[in-house]
């Protein structure tokens, strides 16, 4: 159940896809990745107010219990709902290899 | 890639499964669920320090970028890796029905 997409906190404040530019050094990959030199990392950032993009029944429960016991139960969290693929060219002992990753870049987001 | 299970913050402080007892009223279900009257809600709660139970490459990236830009990029978040099913007996217009939910109770947790 993908619930409401209206953010009660104001535009852009709730869970959504953001892009962060990162170098291989930023990612700690400089010693094992050759290419690409820079990654446009798409990630899920933002608040998850009541029922906003609730991923499933568990997220709805979490919202209810967080309202009741905010010190015990955290609010739902903004995480990837799916991913975009990416190719890295990696250094190996024998030269270079092509490595595909299906879980590297967030494609869209939900709250859970 | 399921990374380290050792919690550097001390026992029980990192991302793990917790059980929270909740009534139908707590969950806002009293008007549509008959049974069970009370649910032992299993959910994922706790901190996600560097590489602790990192769900995938995306979680590892998030850790690196959070270290660099803590005000922009949040730390990974503790969420369900899988779920346990649960049966609810629900009120319907014609009486009652048995409904199975596959996404209600967390089974185990990881950081993402």
């Amino acid at each position: 159940a993908r619930n409401g997409d209206h953010c009660p906190l104001g535009p852009g404040r709730c869970c959504r896809l953001h892009t962060v530019r990162a170098s291989l050094e930023d990612l700690g990959w400089a010693d094992w990745v050759l290419s690409p030199r820079e990654v446009q990392v798409t990630m899920c950032i933002g608040a998850c107010p009541s029922q906003f993009r609730a991923a499933n029944m568990h997220a709805q429960i979490k919202t209810s219990l967080h309202r009741l016991k905010p010190d015990t139960v955290p609010a739902p969290c903004c995480v990837p709902a799916s991913y975009n693929p990416m190719v890295l060219i990696q250094k190996t002992d024998t030269g270079v290899s092509l490595q595909t990753y299906d879980d590297l870049l967030a494609k869209d987001c939900h709250c859970i | 890639a399921r990374n380290g299970d050792h919690c550097p913050l001390g026992p029980g402080r990192c991302c793990r499964l917790h059980t929270v007892r909740a009534s139908l009223e707590d969950l806002g279900w009293a008007d549509w669920v008959l049974s069970p009257r009370e649910v032992q809600v299993t959910m994922c709660i706790g901190a996600c320090p560097s590489q602790f139970r990192a769900a995938n490459m995306h979680a590892q990236i998030k850790t690196s970028l959070h270290r660099l830009k803590p005000d922009t990029v949040p730390a990974p978040c503790c969420v369900p890796a899988s779920y346990n099913p649960m049966v609810l007996i629900q009120k319907t217009d014609t009486g009652v029905s048995l409904q199975t939910y596959d996404d209600l109770l967390a089974k185990d947790c990881h950081c993402i």
Epitope: P36, R37, V87, L98, T100, D102 | -
Partner: antibody, heavy 118, light 107 residues
Framework: QVQLQQSGPELVKPGASVKLSCKAS????????INWVKQRPGQGLEWIGW????????KYNEKFKGKATLTVDTSSSTAYMELHSLTSEDSAVYFC???????????WGQGTTLTVSS | DIVLTQSPATLSVTPGDRVSLSCRAS??????LHWYQQKSHESPRLLIK???QSISGIPSRFSGSGSGTDFTLSINSVETEDFGMYFC?????????FGGGTKLEIK
């Protein structure tokens, strides 16, 4: 904007070698990888190999090992492909292609036509 | 090596038609499939990356779909400038390979 300017057409004799060039402009040369692609008249595309301009590390399609040698000159922002022991089968258009993401080819040179004939 | 088979080899259409071009891989390549257009005596141009991701500057009438072994490039209303050759390319593993191409021509 990113541009890859390739050298002009070549007519060479069988058994000889030839060195094709691809000069990059509009970006930092070491920021993009260079690939070389072969296209015979009326046919499809064949990937020859990849080179990492920062330090010249390269990867070849097994089919072109011994046939092609890829090099770079970072001082002139130029990539080179030398083709050896030429036969009529090597007559083709050769493209250099720049890749930011190594998965696909974003920027292409205009192609160099190589004709091998006695 | 991964073999990419494109079909049909030639497609004759009228401007305004919706067309679908197929690319089939000899083994699963997830989403690691990219599409190019090449007009006569020109260099190829990237149209779609990673099966379905759009490219800046490419008209929105071009779209891609598929995963695994079966992929489709769709043009929802063909324009005269769209005629030419279309190639798919995989980046799941080295060596990168291309399909044999589909020629889109005016009926």
């Amino acid at each position: 904007q990113v541009q890859l300017q390739q050298s002009g057409p070549e007519l060479v004799k069988p058994g000889a070698s030839v060195k094709l060039s691809c000069k990059a402009s509009g970006y930092t040369f070491t920021s993009y990888d260079i690939n070389w692609v072969k296209q015979r008249p009326g046919q499809g595309l064949e990937w020859i190999g990849w080179i990492y301009p920062r330090d010249g590390i390269s990867k070849y399609n097994e089919k072109f090992k011994g046939k092609a040698t890829l090099t770079v000159d970072t001082s002139s922002s130029t990539a080179y492909m030398e083709l050896h022991s030429l036969t009529s089968e090597d007559s083709a258009v050769y493209f250099c292609a720049g890749t930011y993401d190594p998965a696909y080819f974003d920027y292409w040179g205009q192609g160099t036509t190589l004709t091998v004939s006695s | 090596d991964i073999v990419l088979t494109q079909s049909p080899a030639t497609l004759s259409v009228t401007p305004g038609d919706r067309v679908s071009l197929s690319c089939r891989a000899s083994q699963s390549i997830s989403y690691y499939l990219h599409w190019y257009q090449q007009k006569s005596h020109e260099s190829p141009r990237l149209l779609i990356k990673y099966a379905s991701q759009s490219i800046s500057g490419i008209p929105s009438r071009f779209s891609g779909s598929g995963s695994g072994t079966d992929f489709t490039l769709s043009i929802n209303s063909v324009e005269t400038e769209d005629f030419g050759m279309y190639f798919c390319q995989q980046s799941n593993s080295w060596p990168y390979t291309f399909g044999g191409g589909t020629k889109l021509e005016i009926k």
